[in-house]
């Protein structure tokens, strides 16, 4: 049988002679040269040659493991005399053993990584990886060990994994942000003679909130005119924070001071400044200086850094209110006055009052805005603000007069104010009641006595406090011997009733009834209205069939026989 094992050969042999591989040998070989060894298969006769007498195999060329890691060849042993094989043809392996001819190569020439500042020692930063093309199954040619060439004492690298970690406590981004670390990967397990490669790792410390905001000055002073409307910015304050991004975001607030309710502070998100604004209307005459305590704080706190102290700072803000020449101020925002409609001209209705709010207390004069009183019904005393009538009033024409009064500083006519004045005209009983409509009714010739032929209604332009109370009666001159009667219903209506049985339209076709309507107010007002009654022929249902169109009217306005 064949006597061999697998053969091994070092790659990239550099000697001048052929490289010895091994020996083929059959136990049938008696050493007398009777056997002939034949080699075939991968690279036979080219890469590999055999001494046909001894079975010694040599490699004729420099081999490279990465071209083919294994060569499979066939061996034959033949009896020279008979030409017959003394062993079955068999295969064997020549395995090319790797020499360390490949340096470790990092997967990236430059790595970029970040780690939070102030991180604990041993915090993971990044893992670097180097690969080696040599055979990992043979020797240490591909066994890579990592070490740090540059970047100590700040960082360390795990020799087997390539994991870079922080190595120094309290690395402060605000002190130094960028680090360049050089890592070496060396094969042969890092031993002498190993091949190496390097990579650069650019490490940036990312920000954590380890710095509080700080005001660069303890006191700020701003001025603002008292006329500044709410929302007006007065000034800007800015606390500085050595951190960046959201860790440098600042919220401002007013924590104390006399003007806590008079001012606001808002944060400008772009500049991180605190903008002090007016919250309520200021008044120089009431308060001229405000002192506030403004606080700047970080909204995003990291609890582990609270031991460094409060993440806030405060400053004093002094606000000086500047005097502004202000227009006069009326004692009320509006005035409501009343006057009877029968008031005589020059009757005083009431008065308005305005005062200069400034410390100077400039005198004021009053006037009526004539655009609001075109008919010049009212006037005002320019000195004391008394309002009086300059024309007669009529409630029934206009119930309310809405006028505007102007107060102007005498020394500075540009400073003026206006106030609305609502004047209500009170009712006086100066109108008589009247019929609500023109009444023309009819009566059937065959009408019975006490029949209701018409209901009367009255109207009155006046508006008495207790409501209208009208009374109805026939005029005295028509009351006696009238063919009709008036029945006062005591509800501001009255009925006309027949007074006899039957009417003859041929005798009298039309009656004119004078009715007196009186009100119940003081002084009593009354009027006389006329009701026309026509006598008509009716059917047995009382439906009118024919009437005379006209009546005979006497100069007195009373019809004959009324």
């Amino acid at each position: 049988s064949w006597m061999w094992n697998q053969f091994f050969l070092l790659e990239e042999y550099t000697g001048s002679d052929y490289q010895y591989v091994g020996k083929l040998h059959s136990d049938q070989d008696r050493g007398d040269g009777s056997l002939k060894y034949i080699l075939s298969g991968d690279g036979a006769g080219d890469l590999f040659i055999i001494n046909e007498n001894t079975g010694d195999i040599q490699a004729t060329k420099r081999l490279d493991r990465e071209e083919k890691p294994v060569y499979i060849l066939r061996a034959q042993a033949i009896n020279r005399r008979t030409g017959r094989p003394v062993e079955p043809e068999s295969e064997f392996i020549i395995k090319i053993h790797d020499i360390n001819d490949n340096e470790p190569i990092f997967t990236k020439d430059v790595y970029t990584a970040t780690v939070p500042e102030m991180a604990d020692v041993g915090t993971f930063v990044v893992q670097v990886t180097a690969t080696d093309a040599d055979d990992p199954t043979y020797g240490n040619s591909a066994k890579v060990v990592y070490s740090i060439l540059q970047g100590q004492p700040y960082f360390s690298v795990e020799s087997e994994t390539g994991i870079i970690k922080t190595a120094l406590l309290n690395m402060d981004r605000e002190n130094r942000e960028q680090y360049q670390v050089v890592i070496q990967a060396k094969d042969m397990g890092g031993q002498m003679g190993g091949l190496s490669g390097t990579t650069t790792v650019n490490i940036t410390l990312t920000d954590v909130n380890d710095n509080p905001p700080r005001f660069p000055q303890s006191t700020y002073q701003f001025k603002t005119p008292e006329s500044s409307p709410p929302g007006t910015p007065i000034g800007r304050i800015k606390a500085s924070d050595a951190d960046v991004g959201e860790n440098a975001e600042i919220e401002y607030s007013i924590t104390d001071g006399e003007g806590h309710d008079m001012f606001d502070v808002i944060t400008d998100q772009e500049t991180q400044e605190g903008i002090i604004t007016v919250k309520k209307l200021l008044d120089f005459e009431k308060k001229r200086v405000y002192t506030l305590k403004v606080e700047a704080s970080n909204p995003h706190i990291e609890p582990r850094f609270l031991y460094l102290g409060p993440f806030k700072d405060s400053a004093t803000v002094r606000i000086v209110v500047d005097d502004v020449d202000e227009p006069p101020v009326f004692s009320k925002p509006a005035y409501i006055l009343q006057i009877r409609e029968d008031a005589q001209i020059n009757t005083t209705i009431g008065s308005v009052a305005a005062q200069d709010p400034d410390a100077a207390r400039n005198p004021v004069k009053y006037s009526v805005d004539r655009h609001t009183d075109m008919d010049r019904i009212f006037n005002i005393d320019s000195g004391n603000g008394s309002i009086f009538t300059s024309k007669l009033l009529d409630r029934e024409t206009l119930l309310w007069h809405n006028i505007t009064v102007i107060a102007t500083e005498i020394n500075n006519p540009k400073q003026s104010s206006r106030v609305p004045l609502y004047i209500k005209v009170l009712d006086v009983n100066d109108n008589a009641p009247e019929f609500a409509e023109f009444y023309e009714t009819f009566v059937c010739e065959k009408a019975k006595a006490d029949q209701l032929i018409q209901t009367l209604h009255a109207v009155d332009k006046d508006d008495p406090y207790s409501g209208h109370q009208f009374s109805f009666s026939l005029a005295p001159e028509a009351a006696s011997g009238s063919n009709f009667t008036i029945q006062d219903n005591k509800d501001n209506t009255a009925g006309i009733l027949t007074r006899k049985n039957g009417y003859n339209r041929h005798e009298m076709s039309t009656y004119l009834l004078p009715v007196v309507i009186s009100d119940n107010d003081y002084p009593v007002q009354s009027s006389t209205g006329t009701v026309t009654v026509r006598v008509c022929a009716c059917d047995h249902h009382g439906n009118m069939q024919s009437c005379h169109a006209e009546a005979l009217i006497h100069p007195t306005g009373l019809s004959t026989g009324a």
């Epitope: 071209e67 890691p69 294994v70 499979i72 043809e89 068999s90 295969e91 093309a133």
Partner: antibody, heavy 120, light 108 residues
């Protein structure tokens, strides 16, 4: 001329078995190492298995190890691939290819391929 | 173990030069072979041992291998060169590795 011709492909259920053959002609079959390579539909080439010229040495891709067996019968100039415990992911065209020392141990030539479909 | 990476596709105008890359760590230390596969056909060896042409392969096909990249170059590309191209090398022991393949499109 040098020729390789695969056969034995077809439809088989998951868990089933199939035996592929590759008939060689035009060269001394027993002098060459042989390989099986497969190609899933619309995908790239994937090496499957190797056998040395006399069949003493075999080698397999991890994806088929323990399920597939490569063998050869030099007297019949035929290469085989016995496929057991087939899975849906084994669906592919299977090529046999000759390893040619003269071409730096590259594959030349290749057979036309046989389609194996694993589906229920 | 080596891993071979190819671009999924490359486009070229007729007559222009097409370059298809195959990258892997220290690939220069490995022998690379290239195969051409047209639709419905078996692969064909076009370059062996980095830069050698088998008989019958046109001269416009050439190869190179250095650093981390092996390259198949087709100068004066023709319409019939439109195909999928695969690089291949030996991995550990007796295993073989292929690149993912590159589809070459000849425009026009």
């Amino acid at each position: 001329q040098v020729q390789l011709l695969e056969s034995g492909g077809g439809l088989v259920q998951p868990g089933g078995s199939l035996r592929l053959s590759c008939a060689a002609s035009g060269f001394t079959f027993s002098s060459y190492a042989m390989h099986w390579v497969r190609q899933a539909p619309g995908k790239g080439l994937e090496w499957v298995s190797f056998i040395s010229s006399l069949g003493s040495y075999t080698y397999y891709a991890d994806s088929v190890k323990g399920r597939f067996t490569i063998s050869r019968d030099n007297s019949k100039n035929t290469l085989y691939l016995q496929m057991n415990s087939l899975r849906a992911e084994d669906t592919a065209v299977y090529y046999c290819a000759r390893e040619t020392a003269g071409y730096g141990y590259a594959f030349d030539p290749w057979g036309q391929g046989t389609l194996v479909t694993v589906s229920s | 173990d080596i891993e071979l990476t190819q671009p999924p596709s490359v486009s070229v105008s007729p007559g222009q030069t097409a370059s298809i890359t195959c990258s892997g760590d220290n690939i220069r230390k490995y022998v690379v072979h290239w195969y051409q596969q047209k639709p419905g056909q078996a692969p064909v060896l076009v370059i062996y041992r980095d830069n050698n042409r088998p008989s019958g392969i046109p001269e416009r096909f050439s190869g190179s291998n250095s650093g981390n990249t092996a390259t198949l170059t087709i100068s004066g590309t023709q319409a019939e060169d439109e195909a999928d191209y695969y690089c291949q090398s030996w991995d550990s022991f007796l295993a073989v590795v292929f690149g993912g393949g590159t589809k070459l499109t000849v425009l026009g």
